[in-house]
């Protein structure tokens, strides 16, 4: 039987597969047409009649060529901490991803099952590793000569200003206070600039030691709140 001349349904030659977009129906023992994405098999094929396909109903879908009797249900609506990045259509499931300021704590095949707010580093701590779509912020204590006076998921430790005359020495959570009218800001060569909120003061940074690669201990799951990790604060 030359390829692609027989019309479905047809009995394949022994040892031959069915052709493109066909499946072998064990009951009919025939090669039959699959249904296209957005459809499902309303009536299965027989020895004399091909598959009858029908469109998926609202809120259901099939993404692949198939011969399923019913379309799959689209996932539930996205929660308030998520945005819908792909709508539910006859050919694709809804996809929900985390909104800005949140990360995916529990992913699913496509999109996110559970979003969690990005950790905020409290004063005296800065961002060692920024948050991503799937990982939380990692905080670290500000090294000597640097400070952070904010509670933020983006701010890093910044160098103290250099005073001609120091009024109040800086610490990990506070900048130095100068008596001089013209303080000079320390500028490290090859400074790294992480994304930061716009501020009225200059925010030069200096290279910092590599953050610890120890895993975050604050992992928000629906089993109730856990104590915040060192240097972080809950929302």
């Amino acid at each position: 039987l030359p390829a692609q001349v027989a019309f479905t349904p047809y009995a394949p030659e022994p040892g031959s597969t069915c052709r493109l977009r066909e499946y072998y129906d064990q009951t009919a023992q025939m090669c039959c047409s699959k249904c296209s994405p957005g459809q499902h098999a309303k009536v299965f094929c027989t020895k004399t009649s091909d598959t009858v396909c029908d469109s998926c109903e609202d809120s259901t879908y099939t993404q692949l060529w198939n011969w399923v009797p019913e379309c799959l249900s689209c996932g539930s609506r996205c929660s308030s901490d998520q945005v819908e990045t792909q709508a539910c259509t006859r050919e694709q499931n809804r996809i929900c991803t985390c909104r800005p300021g949140w990360y995916c704590a529990l992913s699913k095949q496509e999109g996110c099952r559970l979003c969690a707010p990005l950790r905020k580093c409290r004063p005296g701590f800065g961002v060692a590793r920024p948050g991503t779509e799937t990982s939380d912020v990692v905080c670290k204590p500000c090294a000597p000569g640097t400070f952070s006076n904010t509670t933020s998921s983006t701010d890093i430790c910044r160098p103290h200003q250099i005073c001609n005359v120091v009024a109040i020495p800086g610490n990990a959570s506070m900048d130095a206070v100068c008596t001089s009218t013209s303080p000079t800001r320390s500028m490290a060569p090859g400074a790294v600039h992480l994304p930061q909120p716009v501020s009225t003061r200059s925010q030069h940074t200096q290279p910092t030691p590599e953050p610890s690669t120890a895993p975050s201990t604050s992992f928000l799951l629906p089993m109730g709140p856990s104590p915040p990790a060192e240097g972080s604060t809950g929302d």
């Epitope: 390829a3 692609q4 394949p12 040892g15 031959s16 597969t17 052709r19 493109l20 977009r21 699959k34 692949l64 060529w65």
Partner: antibody, heavy 119, light 107 residues
Framework: QVQLVQSGAEVKKPGASVKVSCKAS????????INWVRQAPGQGLEWIGW????????QYAQKFQGRVTMTTDTSTSTAYMELRSLRSDDTAVYYC????????????WGQGTTVTVSS | DIQMTQSPSSLSASVGDRVTITCRAS??????LNWYQQKPGKAPKLLIY???KLHSGVPSRFSGSGSGTDFTLTISSLQPEDFATYYC?????????FGGGTKLEIK
């Protein structure tokens, strides 16, 4: 990662047979067709056929029917293509490729096996 | 068998250029048109399937369009790594058939 690794180059005499192997890794071997495609020197691509490893059933291009045999060994995730009665115009690079039977594309390719037919 | 005809057979262009390659099928193949890139001594790589769906990991500067018998592959802004030979292939009917290829060279 998903990959297909083919056997080494072969030199054959006209009238002989050649058997090329293709070892799959990084995915479930039995759930995708393995296709064979060849490319003569400086020429385009030509589809030879496919085999479905789950049941060993095949689909060959008419041109190669009777001269080609595709087989698989699911225990080693390896596909084989044997071409018989070789002629000089069978000199080509033979590729195995994982195929999608719904859209008819080849998404993962082996590195190719050069088969030279010369007297 | 369905014949696939590509044009041009070769093409010279510069980095940053917008390039279009066309592929014509001898009969209607709906949207079952796939595009591959091949570099010398290497296996082809899938770029686009089902006329316009980008294969995973393929840069968005590649796009496909058309339907029925006439299709195009467009590279919006040529990069140095894009100089290669491009093949179209129909996935509508057996036997699966390829175009003769378009060699994209540096001008």
């Amino acid at each position: 990662q998903v990959q297909l690794v083919q056997s080494g180059a072969e030199v054959k005499k006209p009238g002989a047979s050649v058997k090329v192997s293709c070892k799959a890794s990084g995915y479930t071997f039995i759930t995708y067709d393995i296709n064979w495609v060849r490319q003569a020197p400086g020429q385009g691509l030509e589809w030879i056929g496919w085999i479905y490893p789950r049941d060993g059933n095949t689909q060959y291009a008419q041109k190669f029917q009777g001269r080609v045999t595709m087989t698989t060994d699911t225990s080693t995730s390896t596909a084989y293509m044997e071409l018989r009665s070789l002629r000089s115009d069978d000199t080509a690079v033979y590729y195995c490729a994982r195929g999608d039977r719904d859209y008819g594309y080849f998404d993962v390719w082996g590195q190719g096996t050069t088969v030279t037919v010369s007297s | 068998d369905i014949q696939m005809t590509q044009s041009p057979s070769s093409l010279s262009a510069s980095v940053g250029d917008r390039v279009t390659i066309t592929c014509r099928a001898s009969q209607d193949i709906s949207n079952y048109l796939n595009w591959y890139q091949q570099k010398p001594g290497k296996a082809p790589k899938l770029l686009i399937y089902f006329k316009s769906k980008l294969h995973s990991g393929v840069p968005s500067r590649f796009s496909g369009s058309g339907s029925g018998t006439d299709f195009t592959l467009t590279i919006s802004s040529l990069q140095p790594e894009d100089f290669a030979t491009y093949y179209c292939q129909q996935g509508n009917t057996l036997p699966l058939t390829f175009g003769g290829g378009t060699k994209l060279e540096i001008k």
